[in-house]
């Protein structure tokens, strides 16, 4: 009976996500057979989050809307380890929008999920950000500095990275 009700709950939860994510890849968390964590296929997973590299070129606002439709946001990077994971899936000759912007042009950078902007956990290329007109952040590769962040005009289409919390069933 217990197993049956757990299965019913799982199925109803899976149905919630089916509209945007017809296929999930799930792994057992720890040793308890009851707990599974899932990411949409073909998203990648790191710690408690799922990531999707969107190769379509869109403006920052459209990129964020695109992530939102999938139940995600443009990526919020919280640690060096997280960035190191993300860059494994990026192409060096491309730039990708982050969920970081300064819409007022006053250098009050803000993350899309309201995570406080912490100057101590930022990975700007040297000399960046450098232009008050450029109000959105990308991550890109520079041969001298490897991967880092740069400010650019928000309306210029770029690839993007979406991030969502893992789905627990």
């Amino acid at each position: 009976n217990f197993m049956y009700s757990k299965t019913v709950k799982r199925l109803s939860k899976l149905r919630e996500y089916q509209q945007y994510h017809p296929s999930l890849t799930c792994v057992m968390e720890g040793k308890d057979i009851e707990d599974w964590s899932c990411c949409p296929t073909p998203w990648t997973s790191f710690q408690s989050s799922c990531y999707f590299i969107s190769t379509g070129m869109q403006s920052w606002t459209k990129s964020q809307k695109n992530c939102s439709v999938m139940g995600a946001d443009l990526v919020v990077i919280n640690t060096r380890e997280e960035q190191d994971f993300i860059i494994q899936n990026l192409k060096r000759n491309s730039s990708y929008f982050l969920g970081l912007s300064d819409p007022g042009g006053r250098r009050h950078w803000q993350w899309v999920d309201q995570t406080p902007y912490n100057e101590n956990v930022t990975f700007w290329h040297s000399g960046e950000p450098n232009n008050l007109d450029e109000r959105c952040a990308i991550i890109n590769f520079r041969s001298s500095e490897e991967w880092g962040w740069n400010d650019i005009h928000c309306h210029v289409p770029q690839k993007s990275i979406c991030k969502m919390k893992k789905i627990y069933i």
Epitope: P103, N131, E134, H155
Partner: antibody, heavy 121, light 111 residues
Amino acid sequence: EVQLLESGGGLVQPGGSLRLSCAASGFTFSTYTMSWVRQAPGKGLEWVSTINSGGDNTYYPDSVKGRFTISRDNSKNTLYLQMNSLRAEDTAVYYCATYRPYYYGSVLDYWGQGTTVTVSS
Amino acid sequence: DIVMTQSPDSLAVSLGERATINCKASQSVDYDGNSYVNWYQQKPGQPPKLLIYGASNLESGVPDRFSGSGSGTDFTLTISSLQAEDVAVYYCQQSDEDPWTFGGGTKVEIK
């Protein structure tokens, strides 16, 4: 008072080149993103190019990408548009304009009087 | 690319009467409560002049008979009481995503 004065237009044969200039005064040119917009005879407006204040980021629509190059000399308060491989459809009045951000978008708030480019054999 | 479609192509209005110009975007140009549509006025032989930005914000120095409204994909420029000096071509433009695109223009004349 903001002033933008375009020059360098003229008659050029198809396949030829032309370099337009836009001399700016009345504002701190080196802190402004700048754009070029064109208008074919009797037609509407078409965005041609944008360059950020430092000159390190440049943007173009597909119609001119690879043929036109926008640049600037902040020490001379001047914006440039180098146009190569010109075609008949590039015939237009070319305007330079200042760019003002508006949240995630922008406006073109000051425009020059324009310079006429005619591509014809 | 985002296509901006203006209507009508031309408009004849009596002095003192209201003129209304419509602009339709091929996809939404809104984000977070702002609409990225601007309106410009171009008089014969002159460069365009910014009238309205962000769909409804009046540019400094522009008479308040001009107003803008709309969101999503549908936008309107209204001249509440047409004056002789308002004879011009009016263009909408989106700045949400490159390439920036303009409407085809609406010519406003005196009836």
